[in-house]
């Protein structure tokens, strides 16, 4: 922390302005009232601070508000927002989208992963829902950021933003993400054809259930490989031979080459030996021919 | 080592058709699938489509739906692709190529379409 | 369908020298939950079939000498052969295995001074 000295009557300061490059830490901190460089906290970004100086500024306005800083602050944070923990952010009320662009330009190219997601956190819970407007400041100036919300939080989406979503946007989504996000999609392309159905639908069938997937294959789709790899393994695995190859269509050759990834490997595992051999691929590691397959959970709820 | 042997010509007039042939040799025939290819001079390389010859399917590429017509026979390693209502368009070399990334290829059919 | 674009079309080097052809893809070919990408590099030397050099973008096919060498992922590609030889002389095919129908570039002649 910063030693408390008394501010030299040359030295004080009436506006935030270029001068105070020049002035040393302690001298900032005596002499650059809190108030005054909350009220002028716009013009602080144009100025060429350095990193300890913004130290400085940061430890005047953690003390003038302890419970977090208010909105018009925060706007105009700059560069001030790379000083900034999740642990401050978290103690903000953001309800602005040009905030959140704002601070989103600031931290590109920076490693703020952590605090980007816990301001998006902020900003819907200051909206009080993760609306349309929300979901196009975020895809346009964060992609991939979506996927750093909590389900809890995606569950505030409503399925008629879903079609502002791109599959870029979901790239780092995690399961239970997908399983917020598959039903409310879901319910938004309901209307649609078939092929177009699938078209929008594939980005969230990382959160598809087993009775979903089982329907697809029924409706020529040619699932890509790397999307059948992102469905739940318990959405695969109770899958036939006959339903991952409809579902796959020329794609199934790929199995050969993941063969040792799941979803693949352990879907493998359960196929009879002569079924896989109708695939073609030389696949092997299934149930041999004659093997009868006891299923011990069944007995053991019964009992 | 492993081969995928194909003839040299084939000379046909247009309206006719033709069946090329791929014989396999020196691996499992029944554990890769066979893919064929067209390569007309100066223009690249098109995938007409595929076939499983553990159970037949077949898949083609739309552009060649109506025009290529891809078989096997197990029992002698060799697949076929039947080309009809031909044009001086279907003029080409065509090649067999096997597996997920294409890692032998056959030593490719010129067919040439002239009255 | 997926387009794959080559460049340069077609390039002329001396033996010894490094040559370096690029491939972009429409879509990412990248399989995130294998991390493959689904791209093959192949040689067609004059009058001869097509063969392949690398598949996966970077894994090498056996028998194929180690100055050839694949790099990229999900949509910009690279070849590389670090010190060409005459035996080169060739075209280089990039082809995408993601998703049907299967698709290739329009290929980069190398010729060798």
């Known amino acids: 922390d910063v030693e408390r000295t008394t501010c030299p009557p040359e030295k004080e300061v009436h506006e935030i302005d270029e001068s105070l490059i020049f002035y040393k830490k302690r001298e900032l901190e005596a002499c650059v009232d809190a108030a005054l460089l909350a009220a002028q906290m716009d013009r602080v970004d144009a100025i060429p601070f350095t990193y300890e100086q913004l130290d400085v500024l940061k430890h005047k306005l953690d003390e003038l508000y302890p419970q977090g800083y208010p909105e018009s602050v925060i706007r105009h944070l700059g560069h001030l927002f790379l000083k900034m923990s999740p642990e401050d952010i978290r103690k903000w009320n953001v309800t602005s989208l040009e905030t959140l662009k704002a601070l989103l330009k600031v931290s590109k190219g920076h490693e703020m992963s952590a605090q980007v997601a816990t301001l998006i956190d902020r900003v819907v819970v200051g909206r009080g829902q993760l609306d349309k407007d929300t979901v196009d400041t975020l895809t346009a100036f964060c992609p991939g950021c979506l996927c750093s919300l909590s389900p809890e939080r995606l569950s505030s989406v409503p399925p008629s933003v879903i079609g502002a979503v791109r599959p870029q946007d979901l790239d780092t989504c995690g399961p239970r993400q997908l399983d917020v996000l598959y039903p409310k999609a879901r319910l938004a392309f309901q209307n649609m054809s078939g092929s177009e159905y699938f078209v929008k639908i594939r980005p969230f069938l990382g959160g598809a259930p087993t009775e979903d997937v089982k329907a697809l294959s029924q409706q020529n789709v040619s699932m890509d490989l790397a999307t059948f790899m992102k469905l739940r393994r318990e959405a695969v695995l109770p899958l036939t031979v006959a339903e991952v190859q409809k579902l796959l269509g020329p794609h199934v050759e790929g199995l050969k080459v993941e063969e040792q990834h799941s979803p693949v490997r352990d879907w493998i595992l359960k196929q009879r030996q002569d079924d896989l051999d109708t695939l073609g691929l030389g696949l092997q590691g299934g149930i041999p021919n004659g093997y009868l397959i006891l299923d011990l959970s069944v007995r053991e709820a019964l009992s | 080592q492993v081969q995928l042997q194909q003839p040299g010509t084939e000379l046909v007039k247009p309206g006719a058709s033709v069946k090329l042939s791929c014989k396999a040799s020196d691996y499992t025939f029944t554990s890769y699938w066979m893919h064929w290819v067209k390569q007309r001079p100066g223009q690249g390389l098109e995938w007409i489509g595929s076939?499983?010859?553990?159970?037949?399917?077949?898949y083609y590429n739309e552009k060649f739906k109506n025009k290529a017509t891809l078989t096997v026979d197990k029992s002698s390693s060799t697949a076929y692709m039947q080309l009809s209502s031909l044009t001086s368009d279907d003029s080409a070399v065509y090649y067999c190529?096997?597996?997920?990334?294409?890692?032998?290829w056959g030593t490719g059919t010129t067919v040439t379409v002239s009255s | 369908d997926i387009v794959m674009t080559q460049s340069p079309s077609s390039l002329t080097v001396s033996v010894g020298q490094k040559v370096t052809m690029s491939c972009k893809s429409s879509?990412?070919?990248?399989?995130?939950?294998?991390?493959?990408?689904?791209l093959a590099w192949y040689q067609q030397k004059p009058g001869q079939s097509p063969k392949l050099l690398v598949y996966?973008?970077?894994t090498r096919e056996s028998g194929v000498p180690d100055r050839f060498i694949g790099s990229g992922s999900g949509t910009d590609f690279t070849l590389i052969i670090s010190s060409v030889q005459a035996e080169d002389l060739a075209d280089y095919f990039c082809?995408?295995?993601?998703?049907?129908?299967?698709?290739f570039g329009g290929g980069t002649k190398l010729e060798i001074i």
């Open positions: 879509q990412s070919l990248l399989n995130s939950s294998s991390q493959k990408n689904y």
């Open positions: 190529a096997r597996g997920w990334y294409f890692d032998v």
């Open positions: 076939i499983n010859p553990s159970n037949g399917d077949t």
């Open positions: 996966f973008a970077s």
């Open positions: 082809q995408q295995h993601y998703s049907t129908p299967r698709t």
